[in-house]
């Protein structure tokens, strides 16, 4: 807490201007009017004043808004938003896209803080939805944006949306957003045709089923190794052999080199010996020829 | 936008000195803070010191302390950059500015030349 | 009062990007967020290009930007246009001896 003195004669801040860096920390406490500060706080992201400074300066709003800033001030922070905390920013009520922009600016090159994230949380809950501007703007921020949202949170995103993801955005994704993902991807995405289809929807498959994929094996779609191997295992187990070839295309070959690893390694303890034979890749690990295969999830569900 | 109007070009012999001034019009001259910054030729920029007319003291860069003096008339909005014992390599473009953030006014120039 | 270091020189074809560096200390560019940069043609005054980083003035293109990252700052300079050829240099404020820094100076050559 900066202690209460008078204004030094001739130091009685008029406008926010380049003079007050070198006021001491008193001096800015007793003669920047708060008032002043709340409508020029554009002028103070230009003008290099310490940390210390910007401390003072933002005790000054923290008295004159006790329930928080209102977005005109919000707006203009500048640098002074990388001094407030999440409780300061729980107070507030962002509703533009351009304020919220502004903050994320300031934020820019460096990981998401905490900040941040309780800035978004109170930018997409006072909107009701992740439309997709906003979400525009998150992805191109922190391309991780996306993946950092838990399936509840992601079940608010509308189809729409779904157009401003890039690849990259989902790359930190786990299975169980991929699932919430993947429906709202396919509705956004299903008048396109057969090859723009698969190039949009290639990096949500992760959330894809079986019937998805067996549909797709038959596009002709040549799907690569990365992209098969991000498929979720239960969606894999039940496609044939010559449904994976066809859904790999050239791609194939690329299976001999994944042999050990999840899916291709379970999809593979599911396929006959005989069928895999018929790949020419020397996978091994297939039923025996003259074995019985009994469908025990099958089974179970009759019973 | 403040502008600022800088004195005429000036000749010197080495071991003299030259007062260069700078006159301000629009805003509040007394707050601004007024660099003098100096380009010898083909050099780059040079940062030689500052003032804020109203507070009267000034700062400097270390290279020019003590021979560097740069003070401000708030009656005349003018701000004055004095630099003595000077050398050949002194020669150089010498320009005010009020250049601190958004704020970017610059004068002129003023061609001082050092020359026996 | 050391200088920000600089490339001396840069050069791209119109239509390209550039990107010029500037690296300071953790008492200037890595401890403040702000820098500044300037252009110069030949014979002018300096013209601010960028302000506190990635700000930019009124009535500068937007095809100028600016970025920092630790102890360097940067100026990204997209669709390279003939006019665009200049020297630029890198400027921050020293808190530590309460005055300016700049850089040495950028020539930028537009192929």
């Known amino acids: 807490e900066v202690e209460k003195t008078a204004c030094p004669s001739g130091k009685k801040a008029r406008e926010i201007d380049e003079s007050l860096i070198f006021y001491k920390k008193w001096e800015l406490e007793a003669c920047v009017d708060a008032a002043l500060l709340a409508t020029q706080m554009d002028r103070v992201n230009a003008i290099p004043f310490t940390y210390e400074q910007l401390d003072v300066l933002k005790h000054k709003l923290d008295e004159l808004y006790p329930q928080g800033y209102p977005e005109s001030v919000i707006q203009h922070l500048g640098y002074l938003f990388l001094k407030m905390s999440p409780e300061d920013i729980r107070k507030w009520n962002v509703t533009s896209l351009e304020t919220l922009k502004a903050l994320l600016e300031v934020n820019k090159g460096h990981e998401m803080s905490p900040q941040v994230a309780t800035l978004i949380d109170r930018f997409v809950k006072g909107r009701g939805q992740l439309d997709k501007d906003t979400l525009d703007t998150l992805t191109a921020f922190y391309p991780g944006y996306l993946c950092s949202l838990s399936p509840e949170e992601l079940s608010s995103v509308p189809p729409s949306s779904i157009w401003a993801v890039r690849p990259q955005d989902l790359d930190t994704c786990d299975p169980r957003q991929l699932d919430v993902l993947y429906p709202k991807a396919r509705l956004a995405f299903q008048n396109m045709n057969g090859s723009e289809y698969f190039v949009k929807i290639q990096s949500f498959l992760g959330g894809a089923p079986t019937e998805d994929l067996k549909a797709l094996s038959q596009q002709n779609v040549s799907m690569d190794l990365a992209t098969f191997m991000k498929l979720r295992t239960d969606a894999v187990l039940p496609l044939t052999v010559a449904e994976v070839q066809k859904l790999l295309g050239p791609h194939v070959e690329g299976l001999k080199a994944e042999e050990r690893h999840r899916p291709v390694r379970d999809w593979i303890l599911r396929q006959r010996q005989d069928d895999l034979d018929t790949l020419g890749l020397g996978l091994q690990g297939g039923i025996p020829n003259g074995y019985l295969v009994l469908d025990l999830s099958m089974q179970e569900a009759l019973s | 936008q403040v502008q600022l109007v800088q004195s005429g070009a000036e000749v010197k012999k080495p071991g003299s000195s030259v007062k260069v001034s700078c006159k301000a019009s629009?805003?509040?001259?007394?707050?601004?803070?007024i660099s003098w910054v100096r380009q010898a030729p083909g050099q780059g920029l040079e940062w030689m010191g500052g003032i804020i007319p109203k507070f009267g003291t000034a700062n400097y860069a270390q290279k020019f302390q003590g021979r560097v003096t740069i003070t401000a008339d708030e009656s005349t909005s003018t701000a004055y950059m004095e630099l003595s014992s000077l050398r050949s390599e002194d020669t150089a473009v010498y320009y005010c500015?009020?250049?601190?953030?958004?704020?970017?006014?610059w004068g002129q120039g003023t061609l001082v030349t050092v020359s026996s | 009062d050391i200088a920000l270091t600089q490339p001396a020189s840069v050069s791209g074809s119109p239509g390209q990007s550039i990107t010029i560096s500037c690296t300071g200390t953790?008492?200037?560019?890595?401890?403040?967020?702000?820098v500044s940069w300037y252009q110069q043609h030949p014979g002018k005054a300096p013209k601010l290009m960028i302000y506190?980083?990635?700000n930019r003035p009124s009535g500068v293109s937007n095809r100028f930007s600016g970025s920092k990252s630790g102890n360097t700052a940067s100026l990204t300079i997209s669709g390279l246009q003939a006019e665009d050829e200049a020297d630029y240099y890198c400027?921050?404020?020293?808190?530590?001896?309460?005055?300016?820094?700049f850089g040495g100076g950028t020539k930028l050559t537009v192929l």
């Open positions: 953790s008492s200037d560019v890595g401890g403040y967020n702000y």
């Open positions: 500015a009020r250049t601190i953030g958004i704020y970017d006014s």
């Open positions: 400027s921050t404020y020293d808190h530590t001896s309460s005055g300016f820094v």
């Open positions: 506190s980083v990635n």
């Open positions: 629009g805003g509040t001259f007394s707050s601004y803070y």
